[in-house]
Interface confidence: low
């Protein structure tokens, strides 16, 4: 019967420089002796070398010299007694490129080189980049373990050195950033920033690195309300906004968070289950009415928490004036002026551009003021007749503006004539 020597190993394998590869391999050889059991030795050689003299690249024979350049990097993996000749190559070097053959020796009878099944190894330049592993999503304030590893690297060869860089790492002790693992407690401001793991084989000048952009989940920390692109001042979760009555109002509520918080507006100070008046960050009032004085609340709802801010809306108006109107009555000339404004305005009467303050000491005029609802009324009584044409004016004003009205009182055929010509001057 013909002796059977068989080897099953892939024809070629490619590995990047500095990385590792496992080449599966199995073999068979004829062994029928039952009376002696010499040790089984297997060897991997560089192609073209003479087995009797050459240094081996890997063997299980403790008495054979191994090439210094492959010592510790080329290793037999698996049980040779079970006909496993798998070869582990670590920290591959360019000079490892080439062909290798396998040889088996057992006693005097089995000495065979499997020259027909050579392994071709090609070592290429390193382009592999490290991987950064961590459990997503990153949550603000929650410590997370990150690790950096180079796919395909293994223990063989000079140790790997690591360095981490990124804005998120600023408070860390420099020693911490030289490990393959680090614990990061991300902050909201770390969202969108880069984190880089750089890796270098000790003794090598070339580094390889991987950069990831951090996706940090964080609840809203602040709410800002913008009116016409300008942020309103906020004190103790409340903002005060004076608005002119009748004006259109468009407010934008912004609460930076990741993922974006759901923004909504409510009338007044709402309960948690209240129905919003706007389901976006935008509140639009086409014409502000005094009835809307009071407030609105912007709420930012987020899986990690919610935040809300109260907007105290103060509706103001310019003075609106009715009058003056004048008539002759028993006590003299009686002029009336009505006005409406928020906040309540001040009012003064003028006679021929001269202000009439309070009541005349000589009793020549008298001023009375009263208010009912949003309207306020003031009356002026002038005692005695008119000696000539006379202009009577009333003026109302508040911090937002003023309005005035006048009447021209024309002298009639007699002093009791009532020719009153209103004129808006």
């Amino acid at each position: 019967e013909k002796p059977v020597y068989e080897l099953q190993v892939q024809k070629s394998v490619t590995v990047q420089e500095g990385l590792c590869v496992l080449v599966p391999c199995s073999f068979s050889y004829p062994w029928r002796s039952w009376y002696s059991s010499p040790p089984l030795y297997v060897y991997w050689f560089r192609d073209g070398e003479i087995p009797y003299y050459a240094e081996v690249v890997a063997t299980n024979n403790p008495d054979r010299r191994v090439k210094p350049e492959t010592q510790g990097r080329f290793r037999l993996l698996g049980d040779v007694q079970k006909k496993n000749c798998s070869l582990s190559i670590g920290d591959a070097r360019m000079e490892d490129t080439g062909s290798y053959f396998f040889r088996v020796e057992r006693g005097r009878d089995v000495k065979y080189s499997y020259q027909q099944n050579k392994l071709n190894l090609e070592v290429t330049a390193l382009i592999e980049k490290p991987d950064i592993h961590f459990l997503e999503p990153l949550e603000s304030g929650r410590p997370t373990r990150l690790s950096c590893s180079l796919p395909g690297s293994c223990e063989a060869g000079p140790p790997l050195t690591f360095s981490w860089t990124g804005n998120a790492l600023s408070p860390l002790d420099p020693e911490t950033t030289r490990s393959s693992e680090l614990t990061l407690t991300p902050r909201p401001e770390d969202h969108g920033t880069n984190l880089t793991c750089q890796m270098k084989r000790q003794g090598a000048q070339v580094t390889t690195e991987r950069t990831v952009q951090l996706n940090v989940s964080y609840a809203p920390q602040t709410i800002t309300i913008f009116r016409n692109g300008i942020a309103l001042e906020i004190l103790q979760n409340t903002s005060y906004l004076p608005v002119l009555e009748g004006q259109a109002l468009r407010l934008l509520c912004d609460a930076p968070s990741n993922p974006p918080a759901h923004l909504s507006w409510f009338q007044g100070s709402p309960a948690l289950n209240a129905t919003p008046i706007s389901n976006t960050g935008i509140l639009e009032l086409r014409r502000v009415r005094s009835a809307e004085e009071g407030g609105f609340t912007c709420r930012a709802q987020h899986p990690l928490g919610f935040l809300q801010i109260f907007l105290n809306l103060s509706v103001y108006s310019l003075p609106q004036l009715l009058g003056p109107s004048c008539s002759w009555e028993a006590e003299g000339l009686h002029c009336r002026c009505s006005f409406r404004a928020r906040p309540a305005p001040s009012l003064c009467w003028r006679l021929e551009e001269k202000p009439l303050e309070g009541n005349s000491s000589q009793g020549s005029f008298k001023v009375n003021s009263s208010s009912a609802g949003p309207w306020a009324n003031s009356s002026l009584i002038l005692h005695g007749g008119l000696s000539s044409d006379l202009k009577v004016s009333c003026k109302a004003w508040n911090i937002y503006g003023s309005q005035s009205g006048s009447v021209l009182l024309l002298q009639g055929r007699s002093n009791l004539g009532t020719g009153v010509v209103p004129a808006a001057l």
Partner: antibody, heavy 118, light 107 residues
Framework: EIQLQQSGPELVKPGASVKVSCKAS????????MYWVKQSHGKSLEWIGY????????TYNQKFKGKATLTVDKSSSTAFMHLNSLTSEDSAVFYC???????????WGQGTLVTVSA | DIVMIQSQKFMSTSVGDRVSVTCKAS??????VAWYQQKPGQSPKALIY???YRYSGVPDRFTGSGSGTDFTLTISNVQSEDLAEYFC?????????FGSGTKLEIK
């Protein structure tokens, strides 16, 4: 065969600028940083900086910031160094170099002589 | 910046001799040091990396040693083709810096 072929010698007037090129061949240009080194006559070597051809990112020696600008043209596998506001102090041989493979075998260009003279 | 000091500007030796070129770093650079040989009119050629590892193809008469701040390049059995200037370089931190060079003269 890996090669770095630099542009020829330059004679320039003070105040002018010059652009030195370095054409790479025989390897994947975008996989390795390209370094630039200055060697003044009879003097030592000074590291100017490097560029990552993959993304154009640069790192400069503080001393050469504002003097040298490093760029690359990926389509032609060429690295460039632009030197501005030249003075006689800038007269030197400029080398491009890169470290190949995991163990960083350095390959250097043949050097470009820049002479600044009125 | 890390300063690499090569205190000997020139060294004279004979063919067959053994010569040591020294280099001192202004601060600890571990073993992140390379040695270069530059012949007149040529680009620098790398001999040693990581203080003591020879690049492929470099004759084994060139050996490097040292760590921390003190480094040595030793050439045993000096040959006439070793006439050149030798530079040390640190790559522990940017900017990379070179020594001022030591010129080897053959008697």
């Amino acid at each position: 065969e890996i090669q770095l072929q630099q542009s020829g010698p330059e004679l320039v007037k003070p105040g002018a600028s010059v652009k030195v090129s370095c054409k790479a061949s025989g390897y994947s240009f975008t996989d390795y940083n390209m370094y630039w080194v200055k060697q003044s006559h009879g003097k030592s070597l000074e590291w100017i900086g490097y560029i990552d051809p993959y993304n154009g990112g640069t790192t400069y020696n503080q001393k050469f910031k504002g003097k040298a600008t490093l760029t690359v043209d990926k389509s032609s596998s060429t690295a460039f160094m632009h030197l501005n506001s030249l003075t006689s102090e800038d007269s030197a041989v400029f080398y491009c170099a890169f470290y190949y493979g995991y163990y960083g075998v350095p390959y250097w260009g043949q050097g470009t002589l820049v002479t600044v003279s009125a | 910046d890390i300063v690499m000091i090569q205190s000997q500007k020139f060294m004279s030796t004979s063919v067959g001799d053994r010569v040591s070129v020294t280099c001192k770093a202004s601060q600890n650079v571990d073993t992140n040091v390379a040695w270069y040989q530059q012949k007149p009119g040529q680009s620098p050629k790398a001999l040693i990396y990581s203080a003591s590892y020879r690049y492929s193809g470099v004759p084994d008469r060139f050996t490097g040693s040292g760590s921390g701040t003190d480094f040595t390049l030793t050439i045993s059995n000096v040959q006439s083709e070793d006439l050149a200037e030798y530079f040390c370089q640190q790559y522990n931190s940017f900017p990379l810096t070179f020594g001022s060079g030591t010129k080897l003269e053959i008697k």
